[in-house]
Amino acid sequence: CDLPQTHSLGNRRALILLAQMGRISHFSCLKDRHDFGFPEEEFDGHQFQKAQAISVLHEMIQQTFNLFSTEDSSAAWEQSLLEKFSTELYQQLNDLEACVIQEVGVEETPLMNEDSILAVRKYFQRITLYLTEKKYSPCAWEVVRAEIMRSLSFSTNLQKRLRRKD
């Protein structure tokens, strides 16, 4: 499956939108930095077949979409930017879903990377727990925004490697 060129443009647009969403000085939030244990090894792209990589990417984008679709998120961010960001993620999900079906086959379940998908889900559970513990404070959201920018950058790099393999 060849992800359309618009997909990588969408990736960049999502990162730009996320960068624009910042509302307070980041310097005031240093004390709130947190190690969420991003599963970097799931995004290095070496041990994966393409089908596995695509389903991990899909999970990453899906979880990001879910995180920024909550009521708490709506209260934290400027609405028009949030809507544009969610639209970009939704388009990426559609692209990836088409690829998952094509690569894995409609009947086949990608059991081989359940651990990888679970690692991504647990990562987002830790992010949600952190936000809850910090009572969804502005600084907590800034830290999460910075973390998601970093994890989306890893996703973008994995997609670039997948395209080079084609």
């Epitope: 910042g22 980041h26 310097f27 240093l30 930095r33 190690d35 991003f38 910075a146 973390e147 970093r150």
Partner: antibody
Amino acid sequence: EVQLVQSGAEVKKPGESLKISCKGSGYSFTSYWIGWVRQMPGKGLEWMGIIDPSDSDTRYSPSFQGQVTISADKSISTAYLQWSSLKASDTAMYYCARHPGLAWAPDFDYWGQGTLVTVSS
Amino acid sequence: DIQMTQSPSSLSASVGDRVTITCRASQSINRFLNWYQQKPGKAPKLLIYAASSLQSGVPSRFSGSGSGTDFTLTISSLQPEDFATYYCQQAIDLPFTFGQGTKVEIK
């Protein structure tokens, strides 16, 4: 490959102005902050200040506030440190280094090679 | 500003020795502490971040520990290339202050 490349050594007279640079490459320049560190001859490291190139938000150490100006041009992935009126006591090696901001990653993991500034009459 | 105090300011040791450098913060910095190595004429190099995380590419003989106000950098078996000056730095609040440095010299 991540690199921070600083401008070359400078010899200046007291009262002159100066702007030194730090060019980032091999990574997303706006995703990392850039910090500046001074090291006077035979002395330790002194933290001067930091800039977020994404919006040019800047903070200075009280010791350097009003003495220097930190800026950045994200279109050319370059941060700057400048003086409007140099003093002999500004003679030092100046380093830039990148910081991951609020994301969880190693702090100041890449450094420039340093710019030696000599101020002498 | 948070003050960082390193001890000792210098030490002499032999190859193979176990070396310990301590760093104390004037107030709690949680685990937001970095350790750097600097050799003459070179830029500092990050060894340890977040008090105990080993930076990629740094030999495992280097380790860091501590939280709150008291921190330690340990070199388990000193190698010839380890003779240098070591600095701690707090990273919880601006300005990010450094310790005054510890020079490790050959005995």
